[in-house]
C-alpha cells in the first residue's frame, strides 16, 4: 500500500511586541518532534496592530481591548482551532513602556493589567505581559538572528541559506533600532567586558558565549528626534526653528507641551516665550549630522573606551545584523545593498535631504507625510549613531548587514524571547538522532 502522510504534528507560539510607536503580533510555527533542533522555528504571520504603542493608552486604558482585537482575531484564524489552547501567548513591552514606568510605576502597571485582562479573553494559553529590560531586548535580538542564521548549529554546511551568511560559526552582532531605544549586542574578541551591567553569559547548544550588550534608552529614532528638537529650540531666537534635518520647504507646527511630554527631553527643558513653534526645513545633511552629534556626550568615559554618555563599548568584532528601524529606514532610502559603501551612503543622504519637500511628496505619493518627512532625520541619525556612536568606520561599514527578514522570519527580539520562554534553546547540544520515522505510515 502507498504511504500516506500523517497530519503534521506542529506547534505554534504567539509573541506581541509592544513597542513605543506600535504593537506587532508574530505567530511562530515548528515541528513538535524537533523542538530542540536549531533553526526549525519560523514565522508564519505578522500582524501590525492599528494605532500607537500601548503606552499612549495611559489616559484611555478601556480602549486597549478593542485595539488588540483585529490581530488577536487574525491569530485565531491562522492557528488551527485544535491548537488554540496549547498555543502560548507572550507580550513583551519595550522602551515606550520603560519610559512610562519612569514617570509612574502605577501607570505602566495599569496599562499592562488591562492588556493582560484583554489577552486572557482569547482561547490561547496566555503566559503574561511584562516590560522586558533593555538587556533582554538586546540579548533576544542577538539570539534571534544567530538562530535564524544557523550559527548555533554544530553542522557546518557547504551551502549558504542567506546571502550574507558566512560558513563559519562566528556569531553575528545585533544592532536594533526602535522608536525609543537602540541596542548593540555582540561577542567581543578576547576582551574583558569592563562593566558588569553590559555582560551576558550564555550556554547554548553546548557552547559558551560571553556577550556584550547595551540598550540606550531615549536613543531610538523618535525619542532622538524629540531630544534634538528640544535641544535646538533652546537657542532659537523666536518661534521659528530652521531645521537642517527636514527637507527645504517643509513646515510643521509643534506644541511645546508635546516636546516635553517625554522623560527623554527633560535635560533640555526650559521656559519658552511661546507655546508653539514652527519647524522650517532647510535640508542640510552636514548641519543635521552636527546637530545630532550634540546628543552624544563623548567627553566622559570611565572605561578603556566608550560608545557615548560614559557607556562602555568594547572594540567592534565581526559581522553585524542591523534590523528593525535600521532596516526599514535604510530600505526606504534604498541603501541596504551590500555593495553600497559608507561614503556612498553619506553622499546619497546629502542628496536626499537637500531635495525640496514638494518634490519628495510627489516622488513618494503613497507614503504617509508624517513618516516621509522624517526619513532625512532618521537616515542621518542612523549614520551618526553607527559611525560616531558605535565607532564603525568606512572600512568596518561593510560588516553591517541591513536585515529585514531571515528565511521569512523578521529579525527582532520576539523570536529569541519565545525560544527562551518555551525552553527551545537547550544549553547542551542535543544528541543527534536518526531521522524520525513518524512522517509516513
Amino acid at each position: 500500500t502507498q504511504n500516506k502522510a500523517l497530519p503534521e504534528n506542529v506547534k505554534y507560539g504567539i509573541v506581541l511586541d509592544a513597542g513605543s510607536s506600535h504593537t506587532s503580533l508574530y505567530i511562530y510555527k515548528w515541528p513538535a518532534e524537533k523542538e530542540n533542533d536549531t533553526g526549525v522555528v519560523h514565522q508564519v504571520e505578522e500582524c501590525r496592530v492599528k494605532g500607537p504603542g500601548i503606552s499612549k493608552f495611559v489616559q484611555k486604558v478601556n480602549e486597549i481591548g478593542i485595539y488588540l482585537t483585529d490581530c488577536m482575531e487574525r491569530a485565531r484564524e491562522v492557528i488551527p482551532r485544535s491548537q488554540h489552547q496549547e498555543t502560548p501567548v507572550y507580550l513583551g513591552a519595550t522602551a515606550g513602556m520603560r519610559l512610562l514606568r519612569m514617570e509612574s510605576e502605577e501607570l505602566a502597571d495599569r496599562v499592562l493589567d488591562v492588556v493582560e485582562r484583554s489577552l486572557s479573553n482569547y482561547p490561547f494559553d496566555f503566559q503574561g505581559a511584562r516590560i522586558i529590560t533593555g538587556q533582554e531586548e538586546g540579548a533576544y535580538g542577538w539570539i534571534t538572528i544567530n538562530y535564524l542564521l544557523g550559527k548555533f548549529s554544530q553542522k557546518t554546511r557547504w551551502f549558504s541559506i542567506v546571502p550574507y551568511e558566512t560558513n563559519n560559526q562566528e556569531t553575528f552582532g545585533a544592532l536594533d533600532l526602535g522608536g525609543a531605544s537602540t541596542q548593540v549586542t555582540f561577542v567581543p574578541q578576547n576582551q574583558t567586558i569592563e562593566s558588569p551591567d553590559n555582560a551576558l553569559q550564555f550556554r547554548l547548544y553546548g557552547k559558551d558565549y560571553n556577550v556584550y550588550t547595551h540598550s540606550f534608552l531615549c536613543y531610538g529614532k523618535d525619542q532622538a528626534l524629540w531630544q534634538k528638537l528640544a535641544k535646538d529650540i533652546q537657542v532659537a531666537s523666536n518661534e521659528i526653528l530652521r531645521d537642517p534635518c527636514f527637507h527645504p520647504g517643509y513646515k510643521k507646527v509643534v506644541n511645546v507641551s508635546d516636546l516635553y511630554k517625554t522623560p527623554c527631553t527633560k535635560r533640555f527643558e526650559m521656559t519658552l516665550p511661546f507655546q508653539q513653534f514652527e519647524i522650517q526645513g532647510i535640508g542640510n545633511y552636514q548641519q543635521c549630522h552636527q546637530s545630532i552629534l550634540e546628543l552624544f556626550n563623548t567627553s566622559y568615559c570611565p572605561y578603556s573606551q566608550c560608545a557615548f554618555n560614559g557607556i562602555f563599548l568594547p572594540p567592534l568584532q565581526g559581522d553585524f545584523g542591523a534590523f528593525s528601524a535600521f532596516y526599514f529606514v535604510m530600505k526606504f532610502l534604498n541603501l541596504t545593498s551590500e555593495k553600497v559603501s559608507q561614503e556612498k551612503v553619506t553622499e546619497m543622504m546629502k542628496k536626499f535631504c537637500a531635495q525640496p519637500w514638494e518634490e519628495i511628496k510627489t516622488s513618494y505619493a503613497g507614503v504617509k507625510e508624517k513618516y516621509l518627512s522624517e526619513y532625512c532625520f532618521s537616515g542621518t541619525y542612523i549614520l551618526s549613531l553607527l559611525l560616531q556612536g558605535y565607532h564603525f568606520t568606512a572600512d568596518s561599514w561593510e560588516h553591517i548587514h541591513f536585515i529585514g527578514k531571515i528565511q521569512g522570519s523578521d529579525a527582532g527580539w520576539t523570536l529569541g524571547y519565545m525560544l527562551n520562554l518555551t525552553n527551545m534553546i537547550p544549553a547542551e547540544q542535543p544528541l543527534s538522532t536518526p531521522l524520525s520515522h513518524s512522517t509516513y505510515v
Epitope: Q59, E103, S104, E106, L107, D109, Y260, P263, K266
Partner: antibody, heavy 123, light 106 residues
Framework: EVQLVESGGGLVQPGRSLRLSCAAS????????MNWVRQAPGKGLEWVSS????????SYADTVKGRFTISRDNAKNSLYLQMNSLRAEDTALYYC????????????????WGQGTMVTVSS | DIVLTQSPASLAVSPGQRATITCRAS??????MHWYQQKPGQPPKLLIY???NLASGVPARFSGSGSGTDFTLTINPVEADDTANYYC????????FGQGTKLEIK
Amino acid sequence: EVQLVESGGGLVQPGRSLRLSCAASGFTFNNYGMNWVRQAPGKGLEWVSSFSSSSTYISYADTVKGRFTISRDNAKNSLYLQMNSLRAEDTALYYCARHGRYGGYGGFYFDYWGQGTMVTVSS
Amino acid sequence: DIVLTQSPASLAVSPGQRATITCRASEGVKSYMHWYQQKPGQPPKLLIYKASNLASGVPARFSGSGSGTDFTLTINPVEADDTANYYCQQSWNDPTFGQGTKLEIK
C-alpha cells in the same frame, strides 16, 4: 531640603474663581509628579488632582472635574490649581504634595507636603 | 472609585503596646497602598509606601503589610508621640484615602 509652599487661598464667593500656587524648592522639580490634596475642616484627606512628571497623565477627582485645572511651570518650579465655579463644599485646606519614587520609577503616593493654603467659599 | 475602609475608627493603646490599624480596599490594589500620619495642625507625613516600605526618617517601630485588598499598619511599641490620625491611600487607581483612624495613647 525639600520645601513646598502654597499660596493664593482666601475667602471667595460661590461661583467665583481662585488660583492657587505652589512654589517648590530643594529638588529637581521636573523629575517629579505633583498633586493637590485637600482637607475640609475636621474631615479626612481628599485627593484633588495630579500632574505627572512629563505631563503624560493629568487627572482630576470627579468632584472637581470640569471646574478645576492643574498646571505646572517647570522653569519656575511651580504648580498651580485654577479653581472656577467654586462651591461651598470646596471649602478646605489645600495641600500641594509631591509624588514619591520607587527606586528609579515614579510613584503615585505623596512623600512631601506643604503646610497648605485655606480656601473658604461662602457668600 | 476604589473605596478604602479603615478600622477601627479610633483606638487607645498604652505606651509599649502594639497598635494595629487595618485598611480594606473595595477592589484589589496590588501592593499600591501607602500610610500617612497626621498630627493636629500639621500636614500629613508619609510613613509607609507600597504596602511595606518604610519611608525615609520613619522609626522602625512602624511597619506595613498586605497586598490585594487587605493591608495593615502596625506600630510596635507605641510611644506617647504617636498620638495622631492615620490614613491609608491607594494608588492603583486615581488616589483615594481611607476615612482615617484616630490613635490615642493612654
